[in-house]
Interface confidence: low
Amino acid sequence: MACLGFQRHKAQLNLATRTWPCTLLFFLLFIPVFCKAMHVAQPAVVLASSRGIASFVCEYASPGKATEVRVTVLRQADSQVTEVCAATYMMGNELTFLDDSICTGTSSGNQVNLTIQGLRAMDTGLYICKVELMYPPPYYLGIGNGTQIYVIDPEPCPDSDFLLWILAAVSSGLFFYSFLLTAVSLSKMLKKRSPLTTGVYVKMPPTEPECEKQFQPYFIPIN
């Protein structure tokens, strides 16, 4: 639940003045309200794509009308917390991360769509979304429970030289196979045609006298 954060300019922070909105909410809603933070929601688990890109939504329940918001992505792994990226944006404008940042993002109302790229298996961890309402006062801070991002490295491609050898071997094999097949086929064809090609042509006398000058060849097969 979101209540009051601590104020930068109004320094007096006694409990009575800080918690009356919560007390009011308590009586209105009959639920316990803790006045320490602004609520930040984010998905529990996200699986990065094969190209090492992970996207998730970071949503915060803004208690006031903030005009300047700072979003920070923290990575927690092995009890160490490191800052992944951070961006400050004016409400209604785009998020601008540093040029060398691995993060990109867009904002829509109280939602921030974050994309982290260039992830590898070793980057698997809990990615925490931290939201700060910077301006106008009071200053609010909210920290999400974190999104566990799993990154699985794609199977490495075999060596290009090795691939060339495989390609050469396969194509050579196919060539010799086709050559052999052609040779066998030709030999079989020749064997089948052999009775038709062994014979002599002889001149036969005409059967009719008027066709004296016309000779019809007749084929005599020789066994």
Epitope: G5, A11, L13, N14, A37, T72, L74, V81, E132, L141
Partner: nanobody
Framework: QVQLVESGGGLVQAGGSLRLSCAAS????????IGWFRQAPGKEREGVSC??????YYADSVKGRFTISSDNAKNTVFLQMNSLKPEDTAVYYC????????????????????????????WGQGTQVTVSS
């Protein structure tokens, strides 16, 4: 009025000890993480040690030599500095920031500049610690 008042600084020989105190007032002590920071001439302010409901944090350079503790009833945080070295010479500041950035969730995190102290924390005026060789 929020106030953080440091005391206990001074001149000490290398190998000596000092105990710094930070008295806080004007806010609910339990809601904040209190840290000790130092700034040597020409250098950036750095986190030395922090304490919150989640636990304690020490910079690598002071581990085993400095001890942070608190007396919640008196809203006071102490920094016991033993085996002091000349490189510990600096102005020591006491800072307070929302304990949401607790050691429990962010080990050492709330002692760094990125976690709210510098822009939104409360600061004392500082106390000079000089270690002579």
């Amino acid at each position: 009025q929020v106030q953080l008042v440091e005391s206990g600084g001074g001149l000490v020989q290398a190998g000596g000890s000092l105990r710094l105190s930070c008295a806080a007032s004007g806010f609910t002590f339990d809601d904040y993480a209190i840290g000790w920071f130092r700034q040597a001439p020409g250098k950036e302010r750095e986190g030395v040690s922090c304490i919150s409901s989640g636990g304690t944090y020490y910079a690598d350079s002071v581990k085993g030599r400095f001890t942070i503790s608190s007396d919640n009833a008196k809203n006071t945080v102490f920094l016991q500095m033993n085996s002091l070295k000349p490189e510990d010479t600096a102005v020591y500041y006491c800072g307070a920031v929302s304990s949401l950035l607790s050691v429990e969730r962010f080990p050492g995190g709330h002692c760094g500049p990125r976690y709210g102290y510098y822009r939104h924390g409360y600061w004392g005026q500082g106390t000079q610690v000089t270690v002579s060789s």
